[in-house]
């Protein structure tokens, strides 16, 4: 029988070399084996490349489509092939549909007497459009105390974050994660990136204690 | 690492043809496209066509009703013939490698130096 | 087809200087500009393509910028290795080169 997609392709660019592609078919499907997503640049003399998806699920594939870095003016065509039948035909403009890469190399100092020091890497080189228009969210949670959950967000460009180590519990575990948006490219908040966990020692001097147990 | 290698005459007579092989190494026919372009002193760089790494092939409007470009993935091997050679076709001929979804060249060929003359 | 006018066509400099490339571009061809270095009897190297992305290996003295009609190739620091000519090429079908410019040493 012929198949069928039940969810058209949906994709997203990390503005620099991948683009990822979801989508339903219509029964259960070997989507390596049956299916081919075929991507061709409009607009200039340019290679048709070929993406062999990968399940994702029973119904639903997956496809990385590898990219030079992204230019705003890029538009792909899409072409969803099973066999010698098409399935499914559409474009895509992956300025219009970013994702940006999750922050890494999330590391948390706390050798700084009073402040806990948060400080990962922006995910692009400096010369990735995306590089000046990161901007953050740091959460911080605790495993030890459940009712503690907070976000905090960096709109600055350096990534870093900083917190008075007085404003955590001493003596428990945290953990931080950290995920980014670019603002002007209207993107969807990336993957939080791998989370760090550490230890608050901090204990606030013997006059200041003294001073919150009399008040 | 990546080479093209090229490989033809260097003199040929006017209406005559000219063929060069431009042999690859470093990297499968099957994923990158190669190009053709050539450089004289009067006319400077210019693109005259394109094999992808499917087979399809674009050219220049220029020379396409006297260009061919062809290959043997096997052999990783790209074929080159342009017909009816004037002596303003004189010039160095390039293979170079195609970089992924852009038309633009990241490794050349050494070249090959053709004298259209009788 | 679409024009590619580099200017200049030629220019003198000496080691340390910084230089300025330019390429403009008959119509709109967006960011999609790439720029080669050709050193005296050898064939192209790619510098910079989608107008400002530095290709693999080309160190960081070199930087593309631009887009629309108006590009340039700014080169800091001048090296020794740096003199030769330059040429920009539009990616927009079909591909057309510049004339070139061409660096020597003061």
């Known amino acids: 029988g012929s198949m069928k997609v039940l969810q058209e392709p949906a994709c997203v660019s990390d503005y620099m070399s991948i683009s990822t592609c979801e989508w339903k078919m219509g029964g259960p499907t070997n989507c390596s084996a049956e299916l081919r997503l075929l991507y061709q640049l409009v607009f200039q003399s340019s290679e048709t490349h070929t993406c062999v998806p990968e399940n994702n699920g029973g119904v639903g594939c997956v496809c990385h489509l590898l990219m030079d870095d992204v230019v705003s003016m890029d538009n792909y065509t899409l072409d969803l092939w099973a066999g010698q039948q098409l399935l499914w035909k559409g474009s895509f403009k992956p300025s219009e549909h970013v994702k940006p890469r999750a922050p890494g190399n999330l590391t948390v100092h706390t050798n700084v007497s009073d402040t806990v020091l948060l400080t990962w890497s922006n995910p692009y080189p400096p010369d990735n459009y995306l590089y000046n228009d990161l901007t953050y969210a740091v959460n911080i949670w605790s495993e030890n105390d459940p009712a503690y959950s907070r976000i905090h967000n960096v709109t600055y460009l350096k990534p870093t974050l900083r917190i008075p180590a007085s404003t955590l519990k001493s003596g428990i575990s945290y953990r931080a994660r950290v995920r980014a948006w670019a603002q002007h490219y209207n993107t969807t908040w990336s993957e939080w990136s791998p989370s760090t966990k550490w230890y608050n020692s901090y204990r606030e001097p013997f006059e200041q204690r003294h001073h919150h147990h009399h008040h | 690492q990546v080479q093209l290698k090229q490989s033809g005459p260097g003199l040929v007579q006017p209406s005559q043809s000219l063929s060069v092989t431009c042999t690859v190494s470093g990297f499968s026919l099957t994923n990158y496209g190669v190009h053709w372009v050539r450089q004289s002193p009067g006319k400077g760089l210019e693109w005259l066509g394109v094999?992808?790494?499917?087979?399809?092939?674009d050219y220049n409007a220029a020379f396409k009703s006297r260009l061919s470009i062809s290959k043997d993935n096997s052999k990783s091997q790209v074929f080159f013939k342009m017909n009816s050679l004037q002596a303003d076709d004189t010039a160095i001929y390039y293979c170079a490698r195609n970089k992924g979804t852009r038309p633009v060249f990241d490794y050349w060929g050494q070249g090959t130096t053709l004298t259209v003359s009788s | 087809d679409i024009q590619m006018t580099q200017s200049p066509a030629s220019l003198s400099a000496s080691v340390g200087e910084t230089v300025t490339i330019t390429c403009r571009a008959s119509?709109?061809?967006?960011?999609?500009l790439a720029w080669y270095q050709q050193k005296q009897g050898k064939s192209p190297q790619l510098l910079v393509y989608?107008?400002?992305t530095l290709a693999e290996g080309v160190p960081s003295r070199f930087s593309g910028s631009g887009s629309g009609t108006q590009f340039s190739l700014k080169i800091n620091s001048l090296q020794p290795e740096d003199f030769g000519s330059y040429y920009c090429?539009?990616?927009?079908?079909?591909?057309?080169f510049g004339a070139g410019t061409k660096l020597e040493v003061k």
């Open positions: 090429q539009h990616y927009v079908s079909p591909l057309t």
């Open positions: 119509e709109n061809i967006y960011s999609y």
């Open positions: 094999i992808w790494s499917g087979g399809s092939t």
């Open positions: 989608n107008a400002k």
